[in-house]
């Protein structure tokens, strides 16, 4: 059956031979209605990429550099299955390209000019493409030929396989630049030896190199890693201090109609029957015909790439930046230490309008990028399409797991002169009911619930975390009779109460009328029994403070808070009747943009922050008529974080633990992708 057939692309006679053997052996173990293999032979990996894009083949396994080619238009392929190395219990699908230095040296990443460098080899990922790609815009002009520019940047190097006649400085630390193990400074171990022997000041290798060459921790402690933010970290901290994370070997397919489920079904079956130590007659990860045919011989198995993970996310911002710099050879005109405009990520139409107005008023220092969901915005920040946004704590957690960092906190209570330097404790997550109802925390089952959005702190993580510890399952849509929790599955009972309008029904953005704090409260007013919101929501939307038709006649005393002990209290008493304390919303950015984002925002809030009194005739950053567009409307200022500059420190141990527990119930495709 053609639709059940996976057309594998082979790039040599030997690969084609192995592919045919793969096809025949799979036929013998799979049912006739299961997936099958067909083989397509092409002259090169690039030809395979083109063939898959043109629907003449379905899959091929590629190195990272070729995954980049596959992702570029017009190919638009995406990673679907990753080879893993190491054990099944601790599968490694990536390695980290690092810059290793001796601890007793005193320079940072931005001070490499004039140092001596040790590389694994010309054109190799960790040893050349990534470090030179990232340093590209610091190289002296002209940058072509590249080897000459690199030779003029460092004061001496060992670059195995370079042309020692044309570029003698590249071979200064290893005469001849030998391209095999005859050169003592060749490849990973050689480049590290070049550093260890004192020939070079920095070695560009992969994270495992230092562990493979120095078994003793005391010896490893004599070395450090250079980080892209111009700090240093210990060699164990390579996950937080690397030049790029590089996928090892990946199966790619078309982004649309790519048969990814079928490819996974096929490869999963293949590893069960013909994986490491499974079969004598055919081995997936070795071949009598040659090395690394179809798959790497060193692979131990396959893992399915999460569906949310596109090629940009898979390759990572640093890797793509490095490769793009090398390939395109373009550099910004502005010096790299100058802050470029900050691209703010706006959620859907209304936030985009406010962002546009901000952009106009900032004289272009702020630019705007849009996405339909918070997770899509976070993904855009990760891949460099956007730079920053302000997030609820639940999304600060997801953003943190995806490598972003908190930059500034929204403050709600501190009057202005001290606001910028004050660390507030947070706000209260509360459960609000109508005073006329007889509801308590203990009899919510079967009632109608209103949530700000799935994954948000007050509206979801805190109440559902508490609920989970009570009911011990994740079927929250069965606990409540119906509700509105924007971001839920469209057919879930937790979308039933949402107002839309269609097709935006239950979407986690302002196009859904019951989204956010004000939306969840409106849901309670019009349809629901309980709303999970922040403690300020009721006062901010009653007593005529919200002029909308649905809110203008509401009275604060018609609503009460549910306390965890089963009692109820006035909305004026959140300190004595709340579900938990929630971390304030915070601005997040990529590490490389954090300083620029902070500097610009502090400047912007001095012009457009809460010191502006007349928002009808001036642009106000923290005002949007209860819509909480871009920032919460009750923000007094954006405050510095000082040492709370990681998501764990910012959110606090207790909240991180609560959200981590709730991950069993996670519906976040982005979180799944970021923890792959």
């Amino acid at each position: 059956v053609p639709e059940k057939s996976v057309r594998w692309c082979a790039v040599s006679e030997h690969e084609a031979t192995k592919c045919q053997s793969f096809r025949d052996h799979m036929k013998s173990v799979l049912p006739s209605n299961g997936p099958s293999v067909a083989c397509v032979k092409k002259a090169s990996h690039l030809d395979c990429i083109r063939a898959i894009a043109a629907n003449e083949a379905d899959a091929v396994t590629l190195d990272a550099g070729l995954v980049y080619d596959a992702y570029l238009a017009p190919n638009n392929l995406k990673p679907v299955v990753a080879e893993f190395y190491g054990s099944k219990e601790d599968p490694q699908t990536f390695y980290y390209a690092v810059a290793v230095v001796k601890k007793d040296s005193d320079f940072q990443m931005n001070q490499l000019r004039g140092r001596k460098s040790c590389h694994t080899g010309l054109g190799r990922s960790a040893g050349w493409n990534i470090p030179i790609g990232l340093l590209y815009c610091d190289l002296p002009e002209p940058r072509k030929p590249l080897e000459k520019a690199v030779a003029n940047f460092f004061s001496g190097s060992c670059v195995p396989c370079a042309d020692g006649t044309d570029f003698p400085q590249l071979c200064q630390l290893c005469p001849g630049c030998g391209c095999s193990t005859l050169n003592q400074y060749f490849s990973y171990s050689g480049a590290f030896k070049c550093l260890k022997d004192g020939a070079g000041d920095v070695a560009f290798v992969k994270h495992s190199t230092i562990f493979e060459n120095l078994a003793n921790k005391a010896d490893r402690d004599q070395y450090e890693l250079l980080c892209l933010d111009n700090t240093r970290k210990s060699v164990d901290e390579y996950k937080d201090c690397h030049l790029a994370r590089v996928p090892s070997h990946t199966v790619v397919a078309r982004s649309v109609g790519g048969k990814e489920d079928l490819i996974w079904e096929l490869l999963n079956q293949a590893q069960e029957h013909f994986g490491k130590d499974k079969s004598k007659e055919f081995q997936l990860f070795s071949s009598p015909h040659g090395k690394d045919l179809l798959f790497k011989d060193s692979a131990h198995g396959f893992l399915k790439v999460p569906p949310r993970m596109d090629a940009k996310m898979y390759l990572g911002y640093e890797y793509i930046t490095a490769i793009r710099n090398l390939r395109e050879g373009t550099c910004p005109e502005a010096p790299t230490d100058e802050c470029k405009p900050v691209k703010w990520c706006a959620l859907s139409h209304h936030e985009r309008l406010k962002c546009d107005e901000w952009s106009v008023n900032s004289a272009g220092k702020i630019e705007c990028e849009s996405a339909e969901t918070t997770e899509d915005c976070i993904a855009k920040i990760m891949n460099g399409e956007a730079d920053a946004m302000s997030l609820d704590g639940g999304f600060v957690y997801i953003a943190g797991m995806c490598g972003l960092v908190p930059v500034l906190a929204e403050n709600y209570n501190t009057p202005n002169p001290n606001c910028e330097n004050t660390a507030e404790e947070g706000y209260f997550a509360v459960a609000v009911v109508k005073s006329s109802s007889d509801l308590t925390w203990d009899n919510l089952k079967g009632k109608k619930s209103c949530h700000t959005a799935v994954g948000r702190t007050a509206g979801w993580n805190i109440p559902m975390g508490l609920l989970y510890s009570k009911i011990n399952h994740c079927r929250f849509d069965e606990f409540f009779s119906e509700g509105c929790a924007p971001g839920s599955e469209k057919n879930s009972s937790l979308c039933k109460l949402c107002m839309g309008p269609s097709p935006n029904l239950c979407e986690p953005n302002n196009k859904e009328g019951y989204y956010g704090y004000t939306g969840a409260f409106r849901c309670l007013v019009e349809k629901g029994d309980v709303a999970f919101v922040k403690h300020q929501t009721v006062p901010q939307n009653t007593g005529g403070k919200n002029p909308d038709a649905w809110a203008k006649n509401l009275k604060e005393e018609d609503y009460e808070l549910l306390c965890l002990d089963g009692s109820r209290k006035s909305v004026q008493e959140p300190a004595n009747c709340h579900l938990a304390r929630a971390p304030n919303h915070a601005v997040v950015a990529r590490k490389d943009k954090a300083d620029c984002v902070q500097t610009l925002l502090l400047d912007q809030q001095r012009m457009f922050g809460s010191s502006v009194t007349d928002c009808s005739s001036n642009f106000c950053l923290f005002e949007s008529k209860t819509k909480d567009l871009l920032f919460r409307d009750d923000t007094v200022c954006l405050a510095k974080l000082h040492d709370r500059n990681t998501y764990e420190k910012y959110l606090g141990e207790e909240y991180v633990k609560a959200v981590t527990n709730l991950r069993k119930c996670s519906t976040s495709p982005l979180l799944e992708a970021c923890t792959f």
Partner: nanobody
Framework: EVQLVESGGGLVQPGGSLRLSCAAS????????MAWYRQAPGKGLELVAG???????NYRDSVKGRFTISRDNSKNTLYLQMNSLRAEDTAVYYC???????????WGQGTLVTVSS
């Protein structure tokens, strides 16, 4: 009720010029940030140029040096002078005033600009 009426669109050859006008009534025109947006066939709405109440302006990169936004507060009118027009400038152009604070969407009917030889 805010009313915005755009005019001045039409068919023009590449390299040609047009001047769009937007008459506003019922808005606090003189104190609002104003902007021109455009929507090309099958594309989303994009900001073309904006002007603050104090008259400082901002443009999208692709129109810088070719388009000029201005306002006449006494006439409650916003303008967009478009020079060196290109095929990719073809779109329906809308003006908006931000005084409503993104709370209600006030959009006129737009004016169609077609750049074609």
């Amino acid at each position: 009720e805010v009313q915005l009426v755009e005019s001045g669109g039409g068919l023009v050859q590449p390299g040609g010029s047009l001047r769009l006008s937007c008459a506003a009534s019922g808005s606090i025109f003189s104190i609002a940030t104003m902007a021109w947006y455009r929507q090309a066939p099958g594309k989303g709405l994009e900001l073309v140029a904006g002007i603050t109440r104090s008259g400082s302006t901002n443009y999208r990169d692709s129109v810088k040096g070719r388009f000029t936004i201005s306002r006449d507060n006494s006439k409650n009118t916003l303008y967009l002078q478009m020079n060196s027009l290109r095929a990719e400038d073809t779109a329906v152009y809308y003006c908006t005033d931000y005084s409503s604070r993104y709370y209600h969407d006030y959009w006129g009917q737009g004016t169609l600009v077609t750049v074609s030889s």
